[in-house]
Interface confidence: medium
């Protein structure tokens, strides 16, 4: 069964003090994380106890493995279900709690009823505060019975459940008409699902003989024991005050289980702990009784002392539960209770034993629950005990189950049972999965669900890279971690699989699916450097750049251009997608800004170092283009340009710039300047004969403005070859600016 | 469906006597208290006997305490009226009703109820 | 014992129309513990109310119930053809139980 315990405090004075815990002893219990288990759920069931609303109470998380609910403000909000929900997948188990308030009509006289199939449970209800009104039974919030006031038997109401089967369990309540249901005795009914001491899905299976009170559970035959003992047939008692399948958990406050209420999964229910009674747990046992409830009684023989927690001490040379076995008697010694083995394994079990006469090796069986009878393969005698070991062969799944140790003298028998889990290795369901990547490194998850069983101890992470024959690498990591593998190739795929262990020989599970991981291109290390950069324009930059010369080939895909506007706050990118480019322009810029400037190498998704920042300042846009350009040939060498002066100018023009190109050549143009802005004419002279030329023209203020219209025109034949175009008035002085 | 049937009425001389049965299906008869109601010809309705789940505690009109005894078989799910020194006044159609209990309008208060199922009814005449 | 007495003993009413039952109780009955029954020549009782105003299961809502103490009232809001027949109050609060006279609902 799950370790799962629901403490109620029922020190009632004040319903502020009050408080209900539930424990859990299971290995990673409450982590909350799909793959170790949901967290422990505590909570008032009102579906069935209908109470008048009241303020939300609150949840406190003590650690993974408790938690408290607490901030009941007045005795109504007590009355009532309470639940608590623990254990993972299929051992998903709910420990029900029914409040009843001490000051109702009616008080049960046993609030939990664990009953087998087919018995008479008998339900009492004892008068409290007397109505003369019918008194109405209900199951599960439904009407079921009512009997008249004078039908109380010695004050108290009766409900009889003859033939009960398991469909008739749950929350049955007694209720007088007119009162409040507040008012109410609440109980609980269990009914297991077979007879007495019987279990398994046919009933067919022997329950082990549950000691001390303990609940042999109708699903898996094990014994639910009372708190304060333990062990697979609740043979062992806890020290006082402690509780838990191990006896691992204390009762909190300096009176130990005084004032507390234990309720423990079905079938077991509800008591108070080892020691006390009483509708609060706060009365001791009276002399002779002992254990859950007082409901034991000792009848310690030669000499035994009943103590109330633990049941008889017996006297030197006794044993037994009523000191009745002689210590010559042999003894099983010191056998767990539950051990706890990997499928597949083949595990060492040790027995010991002690008596007069004294165990030998062939005195002492193992007994398998299909019944086969194993012998010890060796045996340690020493002075005061024998211990005998056993080799057991392979484990299955059947082998879970109740084994028994066997010790047999001349002097009588021995026998113990004990519970062997049988645990299948964790398995994972799905691949592991990627974080983030780098080049020579890649982030993984390895949390995964799985199936089998937990804990998970260890994960391991195998990876190699893909189609690769050479071994797994293996890094063993924490199972709530992420993991970094490191050392990886570049722009290479890997293998990556998860192997799950719980703990104990054996516990490694098989590999879970592959999945491919890619590590990401090697970054770009080469820092490059401007060469030079010059303005082709008020919005057009020409920019070249050097990269240092290096052995072997070049690691990169293209370089990156960044030009920041300081004044906008504004970043322009340009994308050169050749590693061989040197020089690139740079179009649609903006007139008069200053930009700083740098490139970079790029590699996949990956920049390298950036060049050292260069401060480039274009200059602010010129003037609208000339209007109406014209131009008429003069001779075979000469044409006249004319032209009206550009509209709504931002200054005083200072000069003109001609652009003078043959049609159809594939030479450079030529620039003529006109240095008298007020003229809007001039002569272009030098030119071949017979020839046709384009012109285009710009004003220029501080910058050079726009280009006027594209005009041709030829000149007249028959002249001699000229020495090229110049501008009629300052032809002598000035060459051409190109 | 619930229902309530009664039979074993009839035709009978003063000072005679007779048994009426109901028998109910459709619901947890053992669970409910029952009662049995008569209606005299042209005449209103008149509250007789009632008993509870158990069988144990039972009550009677004023008018035939003495007389009439209400009993339940609940393995049979049968409900009786055993009416002995039967007078012309007993003259009457005999209906038996399921006795229920209700909660009041907050919910929370359970109230004894009225009758809330009845049978089609017997009659029972006494006359010489 | 608790006397109930019903008023009118006749009502003669027109299809439509709205009836008003009342009902007097000789000493104060809580609203939880009165209720009314529609009964029909050759048929048996039927519950309508109970707990004074809460109607019963499959009763249609043009019946209601109101009062308290020892004043109540039944009202048919629309009458149905099916709706005439005896009218019987009945309180569940003291033994014996006892019910009103009745009151007839009849086609006009």
């Known amino acids: 069964a799950v370790d799962l315990t629901l403490l109620a405090n029922l020190r009632l004075t004040d319903p502020q003090r009050f408080f209900l815990t539930c424990v859990s002893g299971e290995a990673g219990a409450g982590r909350g994380s799909d793959a170790w288990g949901p967290p422990l759920l505590l909570e008032k069931d009102d579906r069935i106890v209908r109470t008048p609303p009241g303020p939300p109470l609150r949840l406190a998380r003590n650690g993974s493995h408790q938690v408290t609910l607490r901030g009941f403000s007045k005795p109504s909000d007590l009355v009532g279900v309470f639940s608590c929900v623990g254990g993972a997948g299929a051992r998903r188990t709910r420990v029900i709690y029914v409040h009843n308030s001490p000051g109702a009509h009616l008080l049960p006289d046993k609030v939990t009823h664990t009953v087998n199939k087919g018995d008479t449970a008998v339900l009492s209800a004892r008068v409290h505060k007397e109505k003369q009104t019918d008194v109405i039974w209900k199951s599960n919030g439904s009407y079921f019975y009512t009997l008249d006031w004078h039908e109380a038997q010695d004050g108290r109401f009766l409900l009889q459940l003859p033939n009960v089967q398991p469909p008739s369990s749950g929350i049955y309540s007694a209720t007088y008409l007119e009162a409040s249901p507040l008012g109410s005795a609440f109980f609980r009914l269990i009914v297991r699902g077979c007879g007495a001491g019987r279990w398994g899905p046919g009933c067919t299976k022997e329950c082990p003989g549950c000691l001390h009170g303990g609940v042999c559970h109708d699903h898996d035959g094990e014994c639910v024991c009372p708190p304060g003992f333990t062990g697979t047939r609740c043979e062992q008692a806890c020290r006082e005050g402690r509780f838990g399948q191990s006896c691992q958990e204390q009762c909190p406050g300096i009176s130990g289980c005084r004032g507390l209420t234990f309720c423990l999964p079905d079938p077991y229910g509800c008591s108070c702990g080892s020691g006390w009674r009483g509708s609060q747990c706060q009365e001791a046992c009276a002399p002779g009784h002992f254990g859950a409830d007082c409901r034991l009684q000792c009848q310690c023989q030669n000499g035994g002392t009943c103590d109330r927690f633990s049941g008889c001490v017996c006297p030197s040379g006794w044993h037994g539960v009523h000191c009745e076995k002689s210590d010559r008697i042999p003894q099983i010694l010191n056998m767990a209770s539950e051990l706890e083995f990997n499928l597949e394994t083949m595990p060492r079990i040790n027995c010991a034993a002690a008596g007069n006469p004294f165990p030998v090796r062939g005195s002492i069986e193992l007994r398998k629950p299909d019944g086969t009878v194993l012998l010890s393969t060796k045996a340690i005698v020493e002075p005061e005990k024998t211990t005998a070991e056993f080799e057991v062969p392979r484990l299955v799944l059947a082998d879970s189950g109740f084994w028994e140790c066997r010790v047999s003298t001349s002097g009588g028998q021995d026998s113990r049972r004990f519970k062997v889990n049988v645990k299948v290795p964790p398995v994972p369901l799905a691949a592991p999965r990627l974080l983030t990547k780098q080049s020579r490194q890649l982030v993984v998850s390895p949390l995964v669900s799985f199936s089998g069983d937990g804990p998970i101890s260890t994960v391991r992470l195998h990876y190699r890279p893909q189609d690769s024959t050479m071994d797994w690498s293996t890094i063993v990591v924490d199972p709530s971690e992420n993991v970094t593998l490191m050392n990886l190739r570049p722009k290479t795929g890997y293998s990556v699989r998860v192997q799950l262990s719980r703990p104990g020989e054996g516990g490694e599970g098989a590999w879970g699916p592959p999945t491919l991981m890619t590590t990401d291109c090697p970054e770009p290390l080469l820092q490059p450097w401007l060469e030079g950069w010059h303005v082709e324009g008020t919005d057009r930059l020409r920019v070249s750049w050097s990269l240092p010369l290096v052995p072997g080939p070049l690691v990169g895909d293209g370089f990156l251009l960044r030009l920041w506007d300081g004044t906008r706050g504004q970043e322009r990118r340009e994308n050169v997608s050749s590693p061989q480019a040197r020089t690139a322009l740079l179009t649609g810029l903006t007139p008069g800004t200053h930009y700083q400037l740098d490139v970079q190498l790029y590699h996949c998704t990956l920049l390298g170092p950036a060049s050292p920042p260069a401060h480039v300042l274009l200059p602010p846009s010129g003037p609208p283009a000339p209007r109406h350009l014209h131009a008429q040939a003069l001779s075979d060498s000469e044409i006249q340009l004319t032209w009206k002066h550009p509209e709504a100018l931002p200054g005083p023009i200072s000069k003109y710039v001609v652009e003078v190109q043959v049609a159809g050549g594939a030479g450079d143009p030529l620039w003529i300047d006109v240095d008298r802005p007020e003229e809007t004419s001039t002569i272009i002279r030098g030119l071949n004969a017979s020839t046709r030329y384009l012109f285009r023209m710009r004003a220029s203020i501080q910058g050079l403005g726009d280009w006027s219209n594209t005009v041709e025109e030829s000149t007249l034949g028959n002249g001699l070859q000229a020495e090229g175009p110049v501008q009629e008035s300052r032809a002598a002085e000035e060459g051409l600016d190109q | 469906e619930v229902q309530l049937l009664e039979s074993g009425g009839g035709l009978v001389q003063p000072g005679g006597s007779l048994r009426l049965s109901c028998a109910a299906s459709?619901?947890?008869?053992?669970?409910?208290?029952m009662v049995w109601v008569r209606q005299a010809p042209g005449k209103g309705l008149e509250w007789v006997s009632s008993?509870?789940?158990?069988?144990?505690?039972?009550r009677y009109a004023d008018s035939v305490k003495g007389r009439f005894t209400i009993s339940r078989d609940n393995s049979k799910n049968t409900l009786y009226l055993q009416m002995n020194s039967l007078r012309a006044e007993d003259t009457a159609v005999y209906y038996c009703?399921?006795?229920?209990?209700?909660?009041?309008?907050?919910?929370?208060?359970?109230?004894?109820?009225?009758?809330?199922?009845w049978g089609q009814g017997t009659m029972v005449t006494v006359s010489s | 014992d608790i006397q109930m007495t019903q008023s009118p003993a006749t009502l003669s009413l027109s299809p439509g129309e709205r009836a008003t039952l009342s009902c007097r109780a000789s000493?104060?009955?809580?609203?939880?513990?009165l209720a009314w029954y529609q009964q029909k020549p050759g048929q048996a009782p039927r519950l309508l109310i109970y707990?004074?105003?809460s109607r019963a299961t499959g009763i249609p809502d043009r019946f209601s119930g109101s009062g308290s103490g020892t004043e109540f009232t039944l009202t048919i809001s629309s009458l149905q053809s099916e709706d005439f027949g005896v009218y019987y109050c009945?309180?569940?609060?003291?033994?014996?139980?006892?019910f009103g006279q009745g009151t007839k609902v009849e086609i006009k």
């Open positions: 009703a399921r006795w229920s209990y209700y909660y009041d309008s907050s919910g929370y208060y359970p109230v004894s109820g009225p009758f809330d199922i």
């Open positions: 459709g619901f947890t008869f053992s669970s409910y208290r």
């Open positions: 008993i509870y789940p158990s069988g144990g505690p039972t």
């Open positions: 000493q104060s009955v809580s609203s939880s513990y």
């Open positions: 707990g004074a105003s």
């Open positions: 009945q309180q569940y609060k003291d033994w014996p139980r006892t």
